[in-house]
């Protein structure tokens, strides 16, 4: 904002008010200029001279029209779990927000004072409510017929695949494994051979990557392409 055009202080009319961007100085009993954002009052007004404004020094700021004697100090540098989303300037304070994977556990007027890592739901549990800038993830146990085999702050419980014949029933932390009922196409060396299941995930699931497996575990996966599922997942 440009600095206000200078003018001589004046006494407001009885019952009148000062203009916008002015204040009534009780000592001088005059309407006097405020200083614009980025400046502060170096010298207060008198009956014959207006407010003298001066620029804020480095690492200080004023965000509003004001008549403060000193500019405000910018907040300290952002911590390692934060990102600086607004730099400290003469007209605005530094703003720190939480980096991805974190949420604000203790906010301040602008930005965040304390960040915390988003909760990860362990296998057998899925995300019931995703994390936001200011709230943690809420986990829930996977309902019968669904599973989650990951430790994740984003993965939801997904339906078990449906088999003609089940080799290993699914549980809350593992998908169902289907029995081989016909020859399969060869796969990469060391890969498990498995026929295409009767159907892929039921239609109300979201497309999700193949579940990751724990070391030393060899989950059986369907062979060949499977169409992405549509729609959104229910609880």
């Amino acid at each position: 904002l440009p600095a206000q055009v200078a003018f001589t202080p004046y006494a407001p009319e009885p019952g009148g008010t000062c203009r916008l961007r002015e204040y009534y100085d009780q000592t001088a009993q005059m309407c006097c200029s405020k200083c614009p954002p980025g400046q502060h009052a170096k010298v207060f007004c008198t009956k014959t001279s207006d407010t003298v404004c001066d620029s804020c020094e480095d690492s200080t700021y004023t965000q509003l029209w004001n008549w403060v004697p000193e500019c405000l100090s910018c907040g300290s540098r952002c911590s390692s779990d934060q990102v600086e989303t607004q730099a400290c300037t003469r007209e605005q304070n530094r703003i720190c927000t939480c980096r991805p994977g974190w949420y604000c556990a203790l906010s301040k007027q602008e930005g965040c004072r304390l960040c915390a890592q988003l909760r990860k739901c362990r296998p057998g549990f899925g995300v019931a409510r995703p994390g936001t800038e200011t709230s943690d993830v809420v986990c829930k146990p996977c309902a019968p017929g669904t599973f989650s085999n990951t430790t994740s702050s984003t993965d939801i419980c997904r339906p078990h695949q449906i088999c003609h014949v089940v080799a290993i029933p699914g549980n809350a932390s593992m998908d169902a494994v289907c029995t081989s009922t016909s020859p399969t196409r060869s796969m990469a060396p060391g890969a498990v051979h498995l026929p295409q299941p009767v159907s892929t995930r039921s239609q109300h699931t979201q497309p999700t990557p193949a579940p990751s497996t724990a070391p030393g575990t060899s989950f059986l996966l369907p062979v060949g392409p499977s169409p992405p599922a549509e729609g959104s997942t229910g609880d």
Epitope: L1, G16, Q63, W65
Partner: antibody, heavy 119, light 108 residues
């Protein structure tokens, strides 16, 4: 681009209240005064008052004290004017207008909200 | 409060004609805080001239403003059809800000 988007037309009964809104975009909402003006059909412009969203400071003309209440929501960059105890003479178009921050000129105007008071 | 009186209230001008309208203040006003607005039917007013003589963005150069103290004027050097509108003067030398009653400019 600076824009002031005002709420839609209002039809109210005498004695009722209405709340008009003005959503600002394209500039730092907290750094500029927002003013409200009244224009009756075929007539001139009348200044109601103003609010500084940065600290909530308000100014009113004597005539509109008790009639108009100005507020601002920094989080949504929206200014509000509530008009109470409506009477037929309150039927008018109301404008929100930004102060230019330098010469006290009104540099950006909302499209206006028409208020009709009728029984 | 400062009262602004505009004259004439209504005027008509032929295309190409020079047009002048005036704004008289009840007490002296700083030229920095005297402005003009243009309003067309069904539209919001637009800042047209600020601080007595400065044209707002997009205003054609055929417009000019002048004055000091209690007497101000807006002039159009050569009237064009799009200039038909109502023009308001406005002061904020002292609170509250006030407007003139407007000059309605029509095409003859």
């Amino acid at each position: 681009e600076v824009q002031l988007q005002q709420s839609g037309a209002e039809l109210a009964r005498p004695g009722a209240s209405v709340m008009l809104s003005c959503k600002a975009s394209g500039y730092t909402f907290t750094s500029y005064w927002m003013q409200w003006l009244k224009q009756r059909p075929g007539q001139g412009l009348e200044w109601i008052g103003a609010i500084y969203p940065g600290d909530g400071d308000t100014r009113y003309t004597q005539k509109f004290k008790g009639k108009a209440t100005l507020t601002a929501d920094k989080s949504s960059s929206t200014a509000y004017m509530q008009l109470s105890s409506l009477a037929s003479e309150d039927s008018a178009v109301y404008y929100c207008v930004r102060d230019d921050g330098l010469y006290y000129a009104m540099d950006y105007w909302g499209q206006g909200t028409s208020v009709t008071v009728s029984s | 409060q400062i009262v602004l009186t505009q004259s004439p209230t209504i005027m008509s001008a032929s295309l190409g004609e020079r047009v002048t309208m005036t704004c008289t203040a009840s007490s002296s006003v700083s030229s920095s805080y005297l402005h003009w607005y243009q309003q067309k039917p069904g539209s919001s007013p637009k800042l047209w001239i600020y601080s007595t003589s400065n044209l707002a963005s997009g205003v054609p150069a055929r417009f000019s403003g002048s004055g000091s103290g209690t007497s101000y004027s807006l002039t159009i050097s050569s009237m064009e059809a799009e200039d038909a509108a109502t023009y308001y003067c406005h002061q904020y030398h002292r609170s509250p800000p006030t407007f003139g009653g407007g000059t309605k400019l029509e095409i003859k």
